[in-house]
Amino acid sequence: GSSPRSGVLLRGCPTHCHCEPDGRMLLRVDCSDLGLSELPSNLSVFTSYLDLSMNNISQLLPNPLPSLR
């Protein structure tokens, strides 16, 4: 379900990634250098920036991030 409107609830942050707010709604997600072989599965729809550098992701399927706006 959708999360309630709140200023005290944290947006979803994928395990082991580093996240920080980007304004009132959005989230910057840094998943660099984590040895990932695929995209993190629980990305917030409010992700404004995603860093996947220095991982082991060899290919992306078409439309790999359908949940993102």
Partner: antibody
């Protein structure tokens, strides 16, 4: 710099109401939520509720629902917390604090409310 | 409501020590955890958000880790100004709830 300046200590009788103010400066008041948290003597922190000053949308801890009212005056960048039907266990330090996307980054100095007959 | 259990409730340590404080949630909070520091007579201070993100101005000797229900705050080398009370807080669901606190005292 960001500052949250709260009103002074209050002593109230059981059954009365108290209204604590929190004047914000150093940032755009309507861009951040205001949280209210209390701390009873020797105890931990307890969330009371929050208000979005941009449109006065509120969330309350069910424990306080019906007894607490959060309001803002955007013309003076001031937030208010009113707690009614006071009882002795409401004796605590009450804090206002601003938040953005899930974390509280600046806190007021606290207002001591003592409920005693 | 999600219950947050912090341990230990108090801890004696010396300057230079490595200290770990743990926080356990009653259910998975998906890394949505903050850590705060409180000193007597001072405003509460944010140390870490999103489990591991150091707030601006917080020394790098502080670090946060964990996942699921179990999280830790580590101070790699205690400094005199670190003696205080520390609280964890979950930001996964309303109402946000705090741990009972860990009072860090000088040995």
């Amino acid at each position: 710099q960001v500052q949250l300046v709260q009103s002074g200590a209050e002593v109230k009788k059981p059954g009365a109401s108290v209204k604590v103010s929190c004047k914000a400066s150093g940032y755009t008041f309507t861009n951040y939520w205001m949280q209210w948290v209390r701390q009873a003597p020797g105890q931990g922190l307890e969330w009371i509720g929050e208000i979005d000053p941009s449109d006065s949308y509120t969330n309350y801890n069910q424990k306080f629902q019906g007894r607490v009212t959060l309001t803002v005056d955007t013309s003076t960048s001031t937030a208010y917390m009113e707690l009614s039907s006071l009882r002795s266990e409401d004796t605590a330090v009450y804090y206002c604090a601003r938040s953005l996307s899930g974390y509280v980054d600046y806190w007021g100095q606290g207002t001591t409310v003592t409920v005693s007959s | 409501d999600i219950q947050m259990t912090q341990s230990p409730s108090s801890l004696s340590a010396s300057v230079g020590d490595r200290v770990t404080i743990t926080c356990r949630a009653s259910q998975d909070i998906s890394n949505r955890l903050n850590w705060y520091q409180q000193k007597p007579g001072k405003a509460v201070k944010l140390l870490i958000s999103y489990r591991s993100r150091l707030h601006s101005g917080v020394p790098s000797r502080f670090s946060g880790s964990g996942s699921g229900t179990d999280y830790t705050l580590t101070i790699s080398s205690l400094q005199p100004e670190d003696f205080a009370t520390y609280y964890c807080q979950q930001g996964n669901s309303l109402p946000p709830t705090f741990g009972g606190g860990t009072k860090l005292e000088i040995k």
